[in-house]
Every structure is written in structure tokens, then in C-alpha cells.
């Protein structure tokens, strides 16, 4: 697994650099998670042909994965910092159950899957410190999450491969959208 942000060799080589601001830390954390997702996607794509499937075909699934929409205030048109921040945090909290599902889905990248999961928890903490309106953030129900996890793990092999691919792709795209929005803040 890659070293966490702030600890890579390039950072060590610059000991006199100014400490990272909150925004820079968040930015770097997201990029770190995206690198982890890339590694996981490589293993998934090498193992199955899911990555070749068209986005239209993949859209026909029953997963309720978080997605950005105009109303969330994260787009340049109609941008709303507070609404957007709430959406990003809520979305990441909703992704946590899917990241838990990924934990037993990888052979050579098991450590990487764990790193993505743990780094996402850290990212949520960073963002919660930045948010003013924490009351607006809805935390997923643990019981619902537990039953969803059981259901996902009971799928046949083909569906599990499809689910893994969809989670990684959706999480990647959610983070990329978040990154664009956060740089507007």
C-alpha cells in the first residue's frame, strides 16, 4: 500500500516546507485515495472483463451508490459551499458499507483495499472539521448497512465481480467530482 499523504519520499525531501493547510490536506487525501482505487481497479480489470462493459449496461444495477446531482450544490453552476460539503460527507459515509464489502474481494491488493477504507475514514474526519452544519449530515443506519452487506456477499461470483467494479468506478467518480468542488471552496 502507498504511504499515507504527508509521508511520501517527496515530502520527506522537503523538511522546511510550510505545513499543509486544511484544504491542501483534504486535496492530498482525496488524491491518495484515488491512487488506491486505481490500483484496485487494475486488479479487478485484469481478473474480469467488467471494465469493458459500457456505462449504460453498468447503469442497470440495483446498487444505490451515492452520486452528485445539480441540487447538491457541488457543480460550478448553482455552487453552494455548505450544501455541497454536506453532500460530500453524506456520500462518503454512505460509501463506507461498500468499502467494507470490498475488503475480502482482493487477493494481491488486500492491503490497498484496507488503505482506501481507512483513508476514507480520515477524509471524512477532515471534512467534518470543515463543515459548519454537522446536523444536516445523516449517518447511515447500521442495521440497514449490515443487511445490505449480507445481501451483497450472498450474490453469485459474476454479480460480485460486477458489484466490485461498480463500487470502484462510482467511488472514483464521486471523489473526482468532490475534488473539483472542494477546489472551488
Amino acid at each position: 500500500a502507498p504511504v499515507p499523504p504527508g509521508e511520501d519520499s517527496k515530502d520527506v525531501a522537503a523538511p522546511h516546507r510550510q505545513p499543509l493547510t486544511s484544504s491542501e490536506r483534504i486535496d492530498k487525501q482525496i488524491r491518495y485515495i484515488l491512487d488506491g482505487i486505481s490500483a484496485l481497479r487494475k486488479e479487478t480489470c485484469n481478473k474480469s472483463n467488467m471494465c469493458e462493459s459500457s456505462k449504460e449496461a453498468l447503469a442497470e444495477n440495483n446498487l444505490n451508490l451515492p452520486k452528485m446531482a445539480e441540487k447538491d450544490g457541488c457543480f460550478q453552476s448553482g455552487f453552494n459551499e455548505e450544501t455541497c460539503l454536506v453532500k460530500i460527507i453524506t456520500g462518503l459515509l454512505e460509501f463506507e458499507v461498500y468499502l467494507e464489502y470490498l475488503q475480502n474481494r482482493f487477493e494481491s491488493s488486500e492491503e490497498q483495499a484496507r488503505a482506501v477504507q481507512m483513508s476514507t475514514k480520515v477524509l471524512i474526519q477532515f471534512l467534518q472539521k470543515k463543515a459548519k452544519n454537522l446536523d444536516a449530515i445523516t449517518t447511515p443506519d447500521p442495521t440497514t448497512n449490515a443487511s445490505l452487506l449480507t445481501k451483497l456477499q450472498a450474490q453469485n461470483q459474476w454479480l460480485q465481480d460486477m458489484t466490485t467494479h461498480l463500487i470502484l468506478r462510482s467511488f472514483k467518480e464521486f471523489l473526482q467530482s468532490s475534488l473539483r468542488a472542494l477546489r472551488q471552496m
Epitope: R31, R41, K55, E56, Q176, S177, R180
Partner: antibody, heavy 120, light 108 residues
Framework: SVEESGGRLVTPGTPLTLTCTVS????????MTWVRQAPGKGLEWIGT??????DTWYASWVKGRFTISKTSTTVDLKITSPTTEDTATYFC?????????????????WGPGTLVTVSS | DMTQTPASVEVAVGGTVTIKCQAS??????LSWYQQKPGQRPKLLLY???TLASGVSSRFSGSGYGTEFTLTISGVQCEDAATYYC????????????FGGGTKVVVV
């Protein structure tokens, strides 16, 4: 491949729409960007239309001067009220989707460009 | 957003040329380089600061991280005469121009 069309001579203030048509890949799978280049000048990013959420981001200088819209087969760039400063070659480019790119917008396939001349 | 130097450089065939690009804030390794010949469309050379794009000659190499980046062309050939642009990979909020101003390489 990527190809732009619609470039022509227009008078200042006359709206103009440029069209980007692609083949060999699907617009439902790739973000697309518009870049322009004034005669003898450098490349200037205008904006990018993303796939997943359908959001479009523009350079900070755009301020409503351009609008990017996407259909299933084309990506359009509307110059809302052209001025002589908008005289340029307009390029449409695909934003690659390789995992190695991470969060990085890499313009991996470009059209030949279409020339827009704004003059009275 | 991106400052490129020099604006123009002359190099002899077989020589080496170095182009620098500076970002106004840290962009990690999210930087690409493009080559554009007169009257042609730009062509992707490198991405992620140092990774060669498919089909690009190994004469081209890139390095850098954070705010300082370099493109090096070793063993310059006549066909390398072109303008080279760096591009920061963040084209989201608050970006003025994703591209550097360009460096014209003249091969003598």
C-alpha cells in the same frame, strides 16, 4: 477520433455554436473539453463537460461568455456574444479515462480545430 | 496558474533541451506535456509528470512534483521542432488557464 465544425466569420455580438463530433468511442464514457488558440498565441482552456454527474466546469475568465452542452453524439460550444478577442482556432479534446490518470484531466485525443474569426 | 520558461529555445540536432513549468500551487504530480507543430493539433507527450504517452519516443522525459516540473528532450531531432505546453490536471474550480504559455523549440 474527434472533429470540430461550425467555425466561420461572424460579426461581433452574433452568437455562434461550434460542434464536436466523435467516432470510435462513446460520449457517454468520456469527459470532453474545449480549448482555444488565438493566432500566434498559446493554448487556453475554456471548459470541460464531465460524464458521471453531467457537470461542466469553466475557466474562471469565462463568466458566461461560453456554454458547453452535450448530446449523445456531440459536444457543443456556444460563444454567446463573440468579440474580436474570441478570434481563434477552437479545439475539442477527449479527457482520457485511464486509471493511471487518477484525478488528472489528461487530454489524450484532439480534433484538428475549427477557425472562428470575429470581425465587423 | 502555470508559468513556463523559456518562451523560446534554440538547440542543435543531437543536443538536449530542458523546459521548465511552475505551478502557482502544489499540483502533486498532476501535470501533462503536449507537443504542437505549426498548423497541427496538440499531441499528448507525457502525463502524471513523468509517464510517457503511448507511442511517444523515449527521447522525451519528464520530472517534478508539487510546483516545479521539467520536460527534457535528449538527442534532439529535426522533427522535435515544435511548441511545447505543460498543463495542470486540475480543471475544476478557480482555474484561470490549465496551460502554460508554451515554449517554442527551434532546431538548428
Amino acid at each position: 477520433s474527434v472533429e470540430e465544425s461550425g467555425g466561420r466569420l461572424v460579426t461581433p455580438g452574433t452568437p455562434l455554436t461550434l460542434t464536436c463530433t466523435v467516432s470510435g468511442f462513446s460520449l457517454s464514457s468520456y469527459a470532453m473539453t474545449w480549448v482555444r488558440q488565438a493566432p500566434g498565441k498559446g493554448l487556453e482552456w475554456i471548459g470541460t463537460s464531465y460524464v458521471y454527474s453531467g457537470d461542466t466546469w469553466y475557466a474562471s475568465w469565462v463568466k458566461g461568455r461560453f456554454t458547453i452542452s452535450k448530446t449523445s453524439t456531440t459536444v457543443d460550444l456556444k460563444i454567446t456574444s463573440p468579440t474580436t478577442e474570441d478570434t481563434a482556432t477552437y479545439f475539442c479534446a477527449r479527457v482520457g479515462d485511464y486509471d493511471d490518470y487518477g484525478a488528472h484531466d489528461v487530454f489524450d485525443s484532439w480534433g484538428p480545430g475549427t477557425l472562428v474569426t470575429v470581425s465587423s | 496558474d502555470m508559468t513556463q520558461t523559456p518562451a523560446s529555445v534554440e538547440v542543435a540536432v543531437g543536443g538536449t533541451v530542458t523546459i521548465k513549468c511552475q505551478a502557482s500551487e502544489s499540483i502533486s504530480s498532476w501535470l501533462s506535456w503536449y507537443q504542437q507543430k505549426p498548423g497541427q493539433r496538440p499531441k499528448l507527450l507525457l502525463y502524471r509528470a513523468s509517464t510517457l504517452a503511448s507511442g511517444v519516443s523515449s527521447r522525451f522525459s519528464g520530472s517534478g512534483y508539487g510546483t516545479e516540473f521539467t520536460l527534457t528532450i535528449s538527442g534532439v531531432q529535426c522533427e522535435d521542432a515544435a511548441t511545447y505546453y505543460c498543463q495542470q490536471g486540475y480543471t475544476g474550480g478557480n482555474v484561470d488557464n490549465a496551460f502554460g504559455g508554451g515554449t517554442k523549440v527551434v532546431v538548428v
